[in-house]
């Protein structure tokens, strides 16, 4: 009873339940491979509880181990398009601070038009995650085809 | 000590740990694209703790943000089969209540024989999730090749 | 307040937050399809909190339902390589104790060079998970391309 009350009284953030699910906003100019994300209930089913967006990139607010997941679908794509455009590659990494810059997750499209994956990784408050799509094919903005999210798992 | 005792005394359901992992039961008639799922320890490694099955579709019992994941493998498939039968598409969505109907997750097979993905999404008590496989290829019923599950993550 | 204090005082392990993320160490001799994993902060972003490695295979220390995830990328690979070497298949399963041996997750590469998936499954203390890569193509050891992990979800 006491635990249940305490659980209700404490703000969720103090339990460390940081979580975010983002939808694609736009790409940058052709020499900038980053995808720019957006989130919030007004946009549909995307949300940020803890992490924040900084110029379309996801910034972490709480140290811990996170499950990072992503799916990206190419907007104009058939298996022949995808193979003609090889290599089209998606990489998720820490892009700032520069001292912590590292690639966390990397996939190539080869003959497919969608990549999807997930991994556990330690992240620290202030880490900004960037998702780089190399190649010239545009990603789909459909919210069920392209999305990116993180979930705090443990300290 | 007190917290540990309280945690043991409280039923798990009150902590919001709803979770389900389902295996494929069967497909419907050709004009019904839905996959029909089954779960329970008697069937192997599938289970439902909180959510329920309603005529083979998964119904949510607790409001919250969920991690939804799926893998579907086509039963008789090679890369040539998959491309010849293109488009074969898998979509996971809320199919009832009708007022909340929306596609959450969509993937095409293109030249592959398996799709797998996951995403975070808010779900409400009473939401029923449907998994629609469009195209003429049948999915594999092997429990290590085709499965569908949800995990409650936070309120 | 009392809950917050209790949460800080209790070791994380007693809350059941077992989690591991591993990177590829090496493959075995050609007649041994298992991948051999390694983990620890000295190696980069891999870690073991609860589970242990036993000769490169992951051993579970706590009963519960786990999210198991994996990504494997083939080292020297194009869509033509992948299709020419078909079937290259990745299977994750319980390999010991022998009485609990079962395949949990299986994917073929077909014309792709990366597979990635995840599933929920019950695991018991002492279960050892093996990841079998059949075929002659070698996996990439890049830590952002090939990884394997588990996360305790609930009892």
């Amino acid at each position: 009873q006491r635990f249940a009350q305490a659980q209700q009284q404490l703000p969720l953030e103090s339990l460390g339940w940081d979580v975010a699910e983002l939808q694609l906003n736009h790409t940058g100019p052709q020499q900038d491979p980053r995808l720019y994300w957006q989130g919030g209930p007004a946009l549909g089913r995307s949300f940020l509880h803890g992490p924040e967006l900084d110029k379309g990139q996801l910034r972490i607010h709480r140290d811990g181990i996170y499950m990072v997941h992503i799916q990206v679908t190419l907007a104009i794509c058939s298996s022949t398009t995808a193979s003609r455009h090889h290599p089209t590659t998606l990489a998720v990494g820490i892009c700032s601070p520069a001292s912590r810059s590292i690639s966390l997750l990397r996939l190539s499209f080869h003959q497919g038009c969608t990549i999807a994956s997930q991994r556990l990784t330690p992240l620290a408050r202030g880490d900004t995650l960037c998702t780089n799509l190399t190649g010239t094919l545009l990603p789909s903005r459909n919210t069920d085809e392209t999305f990116f999210g993180v979930q705090w798992v443990r300290p | 000590q007190r917290f540990a005792q309280a945690q043991q005394q409280l039923p798990l359901e009150s902590l919001g740990w709803d979770v389900a992992e389902l295996q494929l039961n069967h497909t419907g008639p050709q004009q019904d694209p839905r996959l029909y799922w089954q779960g329970g320890p008697a069937l192997g490694r599938s289970f439902l703790h909180g959510p329920e099955l309603d005529k083979g579709q998964l119904r949510i019992h607790r409001d919250g943000i969920y991690m939804v994941h799926i893998q579907v493998t086509l039963a008789i498939c090679s890369s040539t089969t998959a491309s010849r039968h293109h488009p074969t598409t898998l979509a996971v969505g809320i199919c009832s209540p009708a007022s909340r109907s929306i596609s959450l997750l969509r993937l095409s097979f293109h030249q592959g024989c398996t799709i797998a993905s996951q995403r975070l999404t808010p779900l409400a008590r009473g939401d029923t999730l449907c998994t629609n496989l469009t195209g003429t290829l049948l999915p594999s019923r092997n429990t290590d090749e085709t499965f569908f599950g949800v995990q409650w993550v936070r309120p | 307040q009392r809950f917050a204090q209790a949460q800080q005082q209790l070791p994380l392990e007693s809350l059941g937050w077992d989690v591991a993320e591993l990177q590829l160490n090496h493959t075995g001799p050609q007649q041994d399809p298992r991948l051999y994993w390694q983990g620890g902060p000295a190696l980069g972003r891999s870690f073991l909190h609860g589970p242990e490695l036993d000769k490169g295979q992951l051993r579970i220390h706590r009963d519960g339902i786990y999210m198991v995830h994996i990504q494997v990328t083939l080292a020297i690979c194009s869509s033509t390589t992948a299709s020419r070497h078909h079937p290259t298949t990745l299977a994750v399963g319980i390999c010991s104790p022998a009485s609990r041996s079962i395949s949990l997750l299986r994917l073929s590469f077909h014309q792709g060079c990366t597979i990635a998936s995840q599933r929920l499954t019950p695991l018991a203390r002492g279960d050892t998970l093996c990841t079998n890569l059949t075929g002659t193509l070698l996996p990439s050891r890049n830590t952002d391309e090939t990884f394997f992990g588990v996360q305790w979800v609930r009892p």
Partner: nanobody, 112 residues
Framework: EVQLVESGGGLVQAGGSLRLSCAAS????????MAWYRQPPGKQREAVAQ???????YYQDRVKGRFTISRDNAKNLVNLQMSSLKPEDTAVYYC??????WGQGTQVTVSS
Amino acid sequence: EVQLVESGGGLVQAGGSLRLSCAASESIFNNYVMAWYRQPPGKQREAVAQISTDGSAYYQDRVKGRFTISRDNAKNLVNLQMSSLKPEDTAVYYCTAGLQYWGQGTQVTVSS
């Protein structure tokens, strides 16, 4: 200021042709992948064709062989030549630069 302006839409009979144009500011035209999207009545917006700064072009399967996207570097224009039009091509057509900048759209109606 307006970044992208479409023109060329209209009513055409099935089997006919139309040419859509999208005028872009120089800084956008020179730096972004340009694409045409369309939104049929009551449906989601979908990609039709795209062209990179180097001129490489890609098409949605349903328009391949019927539509041609091109860049006019002298005028900062992206054109979409549409032929063998079908009733299912009826939609509002939008020009976009990297999904970041969008035109206001131009209506294309194909009657049977």
